[in-house]
């Protein structure tokens, strides 16, 4: 089976470099839930952390990145069962001996308080009340995010300069 | 450091479920290269496969998914140095004993011909002329893709039903 790739209904000139930004995402896509400046999608199936990351990626989104305690609380308020847990985009970097968000930034010590081991193959999930670490191979639900980027951002990340 | 998250310049009602689709992506974002129905971004730095996947995800994109030999050829034509290789969104699933795209579909036997071992921790990269497998921990460049989805797709994937 080939990767499912959306076909285009118009003739687009091949190999043309565009310098316009992506369109502003003013509303969330269907099935996504708007929470402040983000669109969130809570999975109904379970996956290891890595597959969860891949799933968000193929949806052109990211595993959830949490800015601060307020955002954590807002997200946890959407979890209606104490027993359900969701992977987020944070795991332990063995080489840097620190918790690292998938966007490359490190966890600030005064942000989330993680219960559990900080060791190789530890990934982070949230429940209704807490933030935990667990083996990344554990299969659980996950949350994808898309940002409602209403302010255009022309800055190119380091890895693309 | 907190995860870098774009802030919104307008007041958006919290916790409101939208049922509109994402806006049509008619042009590629700045720095991205348009190739038929996709926007591609070729990294300039190197990363293990997993970090490459994470990077694309935080850019709300996917590691490259290749539909067929024609798309492979088109992409390889953009690689101007025979010695440079790029991770794509394909790795070996040990449990399923098959090459698996990150969107969950399997490699069709008559699609890409992969040179190298099909074993645990094997990921796939492309060069100007070939498709190879390599340990996923190897650091190399990678390609992200965004689809130019001009046809709205309302179908919800299984994992979100």
């Amino acid at each position: 089976q080939k990767p499912s790739i959306g076909k285009c209904s118009v003739d687009i000139q091949q190999n043309r470099t565009k310098t316009t930004e992506r369109p502003d995402l003013l509303n969330c896509p269907i099935y996504w839930q708007q929470v402040q400046e983000k669109c969130l999608l809570f999975s109904h199936t379970v996956n290891p952390w890595n597959n969860s990351l891949a799933d968000c990626s193929t949806k052109e989104s990211s595993l959830l990145l949490i800015q601060d305690k307020d955002e954590l609380t807002r997200t946890q308020n959407l979890i209606h069962d104490k027993a359900i847990s969701f992977w987020i985009g944070l795991n332990f970097s063995l080489s840097e001996k620190n918790w690292k968000w998938i966007n490359g930034s490190f966890l600030s010590s005064n942000d989330l308080k993680i219960t559990g081991d900080a060791k190789e193959n530890s990934c982070v999930y949230i429940s209704q009340t807490s933030v935990y670490s667990e083996y990344c191979s554990t299969e659980m639900k996950w949350i994808c995010q898309k940002e409602l980027t209403l302010v255009r951002n022309k800055v190119s990340p380091d890895s693309w300069l | 450091q907190k995860p870098s998250i774009g802030k919104c310049s307008v007041d958006i009602q919290q916790n409101r479920t939208k049922t509109t689709e994402r806006p049509d992506l008619l042009n590629c974002p700045i720095y991205w290269q348009q190739v038929q129905e996709k926007c591609l971004l070729f990294s300039h730095t190197v990363n293990p496969w997993n970090n490459s996947l994470a990077d694309c995800s935080t850019k709300e994109s996917s590691l490259l998914l290749i539909q067929d030999k024609d798309e492979l050829t088109r992409t390889q034509n953009l690689i101007h140095d025979k010695a440079i290789s790029f991770w794509i969104g394909l790795n070996f699933s040990l449990s399923e004993k098959n090459w698996k795209w990150i969107n969950g579909s399997f490699l069709s036997s008559n699609d890409l011909k992969i040179t190298g071992d099909a074993k645990e921790n094997s990921c796939v990269y492309i060069s100007q002329t070939s498709v190879y497998s390599e340990y996923c921990s190897t650091e190399m460049k990678w390609i992200c893709q965004k689809e130019l989805t001009l046809v709205r797709n309302k179908v919800s994937p299984d994992s979100w039903l």
Partner: antibody
Framework: QVQLVESGGGLVKPGGSLRLSCAAS????????MSWIRQAPGKGLEWVSY????????AYADSVKGRFTISRDNAKNSLYLQMNSLRAEDTAVYYC???????????????WGRGTLVTVSS | DIQLTQSPSSVSASVGDRVTITCRAS??????LAWYQQKPGKAPKLLIY???SLQSGVPSRFSGSGSGTDFTLTISSLQPEDFATYYC??????????FGGGTKVEIK
């Protein structure tokens, strides 16, 4: 309806083997951690083994490690326990149990079968 | 391994009584604790998970509390169908998932 039905129990001699099966119905079997739990006659409950939804992750109690093998076939909605080198102390009712979904490896058993009796005796 | 000690091992009570069963863990387990009810010849039934969350379909006379090492299951007003054996279970994320020794609730 949502249920689990075990089979395969019986009388076996010490050192012998048995294969237990658990047929699931009424729910999406492939999305749940599944376990085997046993209860010796007149005794308490003892967790034996679990398997993750995909089958990629497995764990065993020390008392059965190296002798028992858990497996699953999601296409057939079935869970299995291959028991080798059986001992008298393995005599118990063996229950197949489903975990609450998405608690990771924090396994709360929300659905149980009726159990199948395994008797190891010469 | 984490040990769970239940007390009492048995309790005699009458219909309408308030019954309290305790479970003590040998080390802190946060709120990773469940309570089950088992009747003779039947499979156990999940009553409480995450120390205090009532499982769907379970009567509200059952409640759980506690965190860390000390946990309690309370039946606010004992009903005839509640005479059974009750087990606590710790579910910290690394096996084995140990059960308490059980508490038998008998008719006085």
């Amino acid at each position: 309806q949502v249920q689990l039905v075990e089979s395969g129990g019986g009388l076996v001699k010490p050192g012998g083997s048995l294969r237990l099966s658990c047929a699931a119905s009424g729910f999406t079997f492939g999305q749940y951690y599944m376990s085997w739990i046993r209860q010796a006659p007149g005794k308490g409950l003892e967790w034996v083994s679990y398997i993750s939804p995909s089958g990629a992750t497995i764990a065993y109690a020390d008392s059965v490690k190296g002798r028992f093998t858990i497996s699953r076939d999601n296409a057939k909605n079935s869970l299995y326990l291959q028991m080798n080198s059986l001992r008298a102390e393995d005599t118990a009712v063996y229950y197949c149990a489903r975990s609450l979904m998405s608690t990771g490896t924090h396994l709360y058993f929300d659905l149980w079968g009726r159990g199948t009796l395994v008797t190891v005796s010469s | 391994d984490i040990q769970l000690t239940q007390s009492p091992s048995s309790v005699s009570a009458s219909v309408g009584d308030r019954v309290t069963i305790t479970c003590r863990a040998s080390q802190g387990i946060s709120d990773w604790l469940a309570w089950y009810q088992q009747k003779p010849g039947k499979a156990p039934k999940l009553l409480i998970y995450a120390a205090s969350s009532l499982q769907s379909g379970v009567p509200s006379r059952f409640s759980g509390s506690g965190s860390g090492t000390d946990f309690t299951l309370t039946i606010s007003s004992l009903q005839p169908e509640d005479f059974a054996t009750y087990y606590c279970q710790q579910v910290t994320s690394f096996p084995p998932y140990t059960f308490g020794g059980g508490t038998k609730v008998e008719i006085k």
